[in-house]
């Protein structure tokens, strides 16, 4: 039976040229998290952290994103073609998978509002 | 479909190192679900794994091999490496290269091989 | 390590008949990280089955594979002379490191 639930940053605006934080949060499980997929709106993999093996960023994506914090993703050089959703997609044992999303505007203007369910440590 | 194959000297001296290039063809090594790995087979026996490498330079091992094994990528080339150090005859055997879906989760196996190559260690 | 005890050593078949190889692992494997292969004499192996019972691309339907914690099942529902072959189960955790069973050979009678 599948007990936890997936938090993540929601709605997100940042600006061109910026950088952004991707943060899901699974909670109210005991499952161990076996892998983290990053995908964005049109399926394609960002980063795969695999808790044996570590962080693995897609080569379309090396020079951007980098690695974290923790199980999320900071998404770089940020450009209008950005805008749109993002998955987390959490492999666990022996729960099965979790998926969170989360939309992400990229806005021209100098100044973004960046909002966030959360904080973000 | 990618396809893989190998190649290196078929006979290597004891105490030498063991040299093998694997290179792919029909796709990008420079692949992000794949690592990229090598087993071995000695004469009539089984299968042993030795190790594995992502595009990145990202490697596990064998534990049982792993102070003497050392992998290695060449995007540029759509190669990757295996170098064996201290060779003795029981390091005889055929060396595969394969795709490592190790990141596909439900789809864990070595999916694509190349053909082999024998390596003989002898003096 | 996960020791993989592959059982019976040799199988003596006739083409038409059913074959039942089995797989048995020294500790609990992920059904997710169980799979089969086939090899013939001076080729690669082929993968056959991963996810303990997904046939991998270009199976034939006559291959299937069943199981699950320590006990793992490959069935070949009815022998073509092609199947003659030696088969390999194989577990793919990182730690412990991923290993290979002794293999199975498959042989005519």
């Known amino acids: 039976m599948m007990t936890g639930t997936i938090e993540t940053t929601g709605n997100i605006s940042a600006k061109k040229g910026g950088s952004v934080i991707l943060q899901c949060h699974l909670s109210s499980t005991m499952a161990q998290v076996t892998q983290v997929n990053w995908e964005q709106h049109d399926h394609s993999l960002l980063a795969i952290r695999n808790a044996e093996l570590g962080w693995h960023i897609y080569p379309a994506f090396k020079d951007r994103v980098a690695p974290g914090p923790g199980l999320g993703l900071t998404l770089q050089s940020l450009t209008m073609n950005d805008t749109g959703e993002y998955f987390c997609t959490y492999h666990t044992y022996p729960d099965g998978t979790y998926r969170g999303r989360i939309f992400l505007e990229v806005l021209e203007s100098s100044v973004a509002e960046h909002s966030a369910r959360f904080q973000i440590p | 479909q990618v396809q893989l194959q190998e190649s290196g000297p078929g006979l290597v001296k004891p105490s030498q190192t063991l040299s093998l290039t694997c290179t792919a063809s029909?796709?990008?090594?420079?692949?992000?679900?794949?690592?990229w790995g090598w087993i071995r087979q000695p004469p009539g026996k089984g299968l042993e794994w030795i190790g594995s490498?992502?595009?990145?330079?990202?490697?596990y091992y064998n534990p049982s091999l792993k102070s003497r094994v050392t992998i290695s990528v060449d995007t540029s080339k759509n190669q990757f490496s295996l170098k064996l150090s201290s060779v003795t005859a029981a390091d005889t055997a055929v060396y595969y290269c394969?795709?490592?879906?190790?990141?596909?989760?439900?789809?864990?196996?070595?999916?694509?091989w190349g053909q082999g190559t024998m390596v003989t260690v002898s003096s | 390590e996960i020791v993989l005890t592959q059982s019976p050593g040799t199988l003596s078949l006739s083409p038409g008949e059913r074959a039942t190889l089995s797989c048995r692992a020294s500790?609990?494997?992920?059904?997710?990280?169980l799979a089969w292969y086939q090899q013939k004499p001076g080729q690669a192996p082929r993968l056959l089955i991963y996810g303990a019972s997904s046939r991998a691309t270009g199976i034939p339907d006559r291959f299937s594979g069943s199981g699950s914690g320590t006990d793992f099942t490959l069935t070949i529902s009815r022998l073509e002379p092609e199947d003659f072959a030696v088969y390999y189960c194989q577990q793919h955790t990182v730690r412990p490191p991923l290993t290979f069973g002794g293999g199975t050979k498959v042989e005519i009678k």
């Open positions: 490498i992502y595009y990145s330079g990202s490697t």
């Open positions: 500790q609990s494997v992920s059904s997710s990280y």
């Open positions: 394969a795709r490592d879906g190790v990141l596909a989760l439900n789809k864990r196996s070595f999916d694509i």
């Open positions: 029909g796709g990008s090594i420079e692949s992000g679900l794949y690592y």
